[in-house]
């Protein structure tokens, strides 16, 4: 179950793995994330109730049960990890903190015009992992302007404390701005020499590169494959750094694959997760528990759904014993990693898949779409639902998005006039408008919940939320589409498409076949330039075709603006206005979706 | 942990030069300040000048024509040269390390004594 | 150059009194002003920078306050290992400088 609410003036109790330095509670729930054993935090806010040096302090915890005792305790903030919230899950963290100093090992000191500056030398420098700036205003005079690069032994500050005029920050790295660049390629047969910054067992070099891209101080490593020559050294993976960011030397060396840190690349970083099954392999560690199950598919299924499992070895039936069914073996371990990795006994061995983005019935492969055509097939945009009125007479009211079994996404100005959810009616697996009859089958709305920041579709907020009074079972033609990633808020989206039942020109009718149009992203700078009587905030996004020609119209609304990238379809946008129809250097204005993820879980997640 | 330690000659001839290393450890000299401060026997502390992450220096204006102080960053070391010694120099020498201006560690010192 | 005058060379005190230091700047310098306790035969030590705040590990029963040019430092509590030499320094302006120092002794 995934929670994402915090909670004020609560300390979880007991469960203890470590303490970190966070500059919030946000930041502390993206720590908890990442580590392999916390499930649950507590965060000591600045009070003047709590003593100072526990001010901004992160314990992570960990609990058999998942939970643990509530205590309150003023400026104490608590609550889970993003373990099993899919697409919440990103290292990337843009946040400036003001007043804050971030402590750890000053490495460069420079002077820059500007915070942001300050930032992008961060980001733009191998070793650094945060930055304290001291701003125009700070009390002294030499020491203005002065930005410090720092880094630590875990990537998070020694220690923080309150001072004035300063402002402090993360590398972005993590959210792919750094002009670093990075190097992809795999050397086989060659060793890196340099500093160990850890010893991990993995499977392959490939999961030891993730492995590496994920530490705060591993620039590249160096793998040893199961048949090095050394037994006690197989299948180890070093994770390495170097004062110059770059291997001092490397050695031709038989059996080993070295590579280097993806953290600097200009991509999303690689998912935090590793989905191959290796087989004949077994992983050693501490067991969580021993299920029965039909194949290791179903095993690595198991063991994903067990938050605090690891990693897998699932052994299968001998003969025809126990139904058919092999054993499968949960595990963890203190850093993630197997204790040890042996082979040929027979087993298959696989990760949880609880940190992929992957993890999700979103991510299902669905049909190949026809291209070029702009009438689409069915089970073709399976999260595409057509929302009817029923008063005065049935009609189709606006387009929605299924984002859950129980929630449509849609636009908050297809409410305007609706007095009540009883007249509403959500039909999926629609393609055909006139396939809908008096007996077909529909969805009832219990609540209609509107952003309580909207006043009109050209002034944002442009979003709102149908709790269904039933759930939806997903089947090929109606399943839930992902939300965007807060960590792919810099991914440039190439295959975007915009669909609905609406109108094919500015005077015309519903359609009956649900239409489709691909439609390329416009720059809010340039979208700006094309409405330069509205404001286009970040909380929109734009489409469009310079010459026009291809657009949303009347009855898309509320629809998706759905683009495919990495194999996945993402709720990017929702058909929200703009100024007519498919007209030359007018984008269509739809709500930015990224910038309301946050909005969507606290909606969807409310007890 | 963060670590300075001064080495000095002890004792030097009026009107000679001196020079005092300051050696430190735990922390980066390209991403903090050093300074050098003095304290003659029985007085007080008086400022004598730093050296900034990025090399940059500021000296004490009424002894700046007899200072200079430089570093090597790879070996981790501060250096203090002063020229024309008189007895009113004989002090013990101390570095210590920048936050925003003030001084958040501190060598052990070294005693200079400036006699003939 | 800025020069920081601590009028009072030396102050008596007992265990359990609340004592208070001055420094005054020759001109302003903003709120860059660190505090130091030097014990004999010993370093320097910060316990107060940027006039108010703590160095780590500094009890709480020090303070500091004052802007501009005048300047205090605050013991609320005297113990008997807080008898020192007690030092203000400006960190507004190269060249930095310290005032003569206060010198707090048993009454």
């Known amino acids: 179950e995934c929670v994402t609410q915090l909670l004020k003036d609560t300390c979880f109790e007991g469960g203890d793995i470590t303490t970190v330095f966070t500059p919030s509670a946000k930041y502390c729930q993206v720590v908890c994330t990442y580590h392999p054993r916390c499930l649950l935090f507590t965060f000591t806010a600045e009070s003047p109730s709590e003593d100072p040096t526990r001010w901004f302090t992160c314990v992570l915890k960990d609990s058999v049960t998942e939970t643990l005792p509530r205590v309150n305790r003023t400026a104490a903030i608590s609550g889970y990890s993003f373990k099993q919230c899919s697409h919440q899950i990103s290292a990337c963290n843009k946040d400036i903190y003001v007043d804050l100093d971030m402590k750890g090992i000053n490495y460069n000191s420079s002077v820059a015009k500007s915070a942001q500056e300050c930032q992008e030398r961060c980001t733009d420098d191998v070793h650094c992992h945060f930055f304290t700036y001291a701003t125009r205003q700070f009390p002294s005079l030499e020491h203005r302007n002065i930005c410090l690069l720092k880094h630590t032994q875990t990537g998070t500050p020694t220690r923080i404390t309150k001072l004035d005029k300063v402002v402090s920050g993360f590398s972005l790295k993590s959210c792919a701005l750094s002009n670093l660049g990075c190097h992809m390629n795999i050397f086989q047969h060659l060793a890196f020499s340099d500093v160990d910054v850890a010893r991990v067992l993995t499977p392959d070099a490939f999961v030891c590169r993730t492995i590496c891209t994920y530490h705060p101080n591993c620039l590249f490593f160096t793998f040893y494959t199961n048949v090095w020559k050394i037994e006690s050294q197989r299948n180890v993976c070093l994770l390495k750094t170097s004062e110059s960011g770059t291997p001092s030397s490397s050695t031709p060396q038989e059996n080993t694959i070295s590579g280097y840190s993806l953290l600097t690349c200009k991509r999303t970083l690689p998912e935090f997760c590793h989905s191959s099954f290796y087989h004949d392999t077994d992983f050693l560690g501490e067991e969580l528990d021993i299920v029965a199950a039909k194949s290791h598919e179903a095993c690595q299924k198991l063991c994903t759904n067990a938050v605090r499992c690891q990693f897998f070895t699932y052994t299968p039936a001998q003969a025809s014993c126990n139904e058919g069914k092999g054993k499968c073996y949960l595990k963890l371990s203190s850093n993630g990693s197997p204790t040890k990795i042996l082979h040929g006994r027979g087993g298959i061995s696989g990760y949880t898949l609880r940190l992929c983005k992957m993890d999700n019935e979103c991510t299902t492969k669905i049909k190949p779409r026809i291209v070029g055509g702009t009438a689409s097939v069915r089970g073709e945009w399976p999260w595409q639902v057509t929302l009817h009125t029923t008063s005065p007479t049935q009609r189709h009211l606006c387009g929605g998005s299924i984002i859950g079994n129980q929630w449509i996404l849609t636009a908050a100005h297809c409410f305007y006039g609706v007095e009540s959810p009883k007249i509403l009616r959500v039909y999926s697996g629609i393609l055909n408008q006139s396939e809908i009859k008096e007996d077909t089958s529909f969805f009832g709305v219990q609540e209609i919940i509107i952003h309580d920041q909207y006043k009109m579709a050209e002034s944002g907020y442009d979003i709102a939320l149908l709790k269904l009074e039933t759930t939806v079972n997903y089947t090929d033609s109606q399943r839930p589409i992902c939300l965007p990633s807060k960590g792919d808020r810099n991914v440039i989206y190439t295959d975007c498409w915009v669909t609905g039942w609406g109108y094919r020109k500015l005077r015309d009718k519903i359609q009956n076949t649900l239409q489709k149009a691909k439609i390329p992203l416009v720059t809010n700078e340039e979208c700006q330039k094309r409405y330069r009587g509205h404001k286009i905030t970040h909380k929109m996004i734009c489409a469009g075709y310079r010459e026009g020609g291809k657009d949303a119209c009347k009855g898309d609304s509320g629809g998706p603006l759905s683009c495919k990238h990495n194999e996945v379809w993402h709720l990017v946008g929702i058909t929200s206005w703009g100024e007519g129809c498919a007209q030359r250097e007018r984008p269509g204005v739809y709500t930015n979706v990224v910038e309301y993820v946050d909005w969507i879980l606290e909606k969807t997640q409310a007890v | 942990q963060v670590q300075l330690e001064e080495s000095g000659p002890g004792l030097v001839a009026p009107s000679q030069s001196l020079s005092i290393t300051c050696t430190v450890s735990?922390?980066?000299?390209?991403?903090?300040?050093i300074y050098w401060v003095r304290q003659p026997p029985g007085k007080g502390l008086e400022w004598l000048g730093m050296?900034?992450?990025?090399?940059?220096?500021d000296y004490n204006s009424a002894l700046k024509s007899r200072l200079s102080i430089s570093k090597d960053n790879s070996k981790s070391q501060v250096f203090l040269k002063m020229n024309s010694l008189q007895t009113d120099d004989t002090a013990r020498y101390y570095c210590?390390?920048?936050?925003?201006?003030?001084?958040?560690?501190w060598g052990q010192g070294t005693t200079l004594t400036v006699s003939s | 150059d800025i020069v920081m005058t601590q009028s009072h060379k030396f102050m008596s005190t007992s265990v359990g009194d609340r004592v208070s230091i001055t420094c005054k700047a020759s001109?302003?310098?903003?709120?860059?002003v660190a505090w130091y306790q030097q014990k004999p035969g010993q370093s320097p030590k910060l316990l107060i920078y940027?006039?108010?705040y703590r160095n780590t590990g500094v009890p709480d029963r020090f303070t500091g306050s004052g802007s501009g040019t005048d300047f205090t430092f605050t013991i609320s509590s005297v113990q008997a290992e807080d008898l020192a030499v007690y030092y203000c320094?400006?960190?507004?302006?190269?060249?930095?400088?310290f005032g003569g120092g206060t010198k707090l002794e048993r009454l």
């Open positions: 940027l006039t108010s």
């Open positions: 050296i900034w992450g990025d090399g940059r220096t």
């Open positions: 320094q400006q960190h507004y302006k190269t060249p930095y400088s």
């Open positions: 001109q302003d310098v903003s709120t860059a």
């Open positions: 210590a390390r920048d936050y925003y201006g003030s001084k958040d560690y």
């Open positions: 735990g922390f980066s000299l390209t991403g903090y300040g």
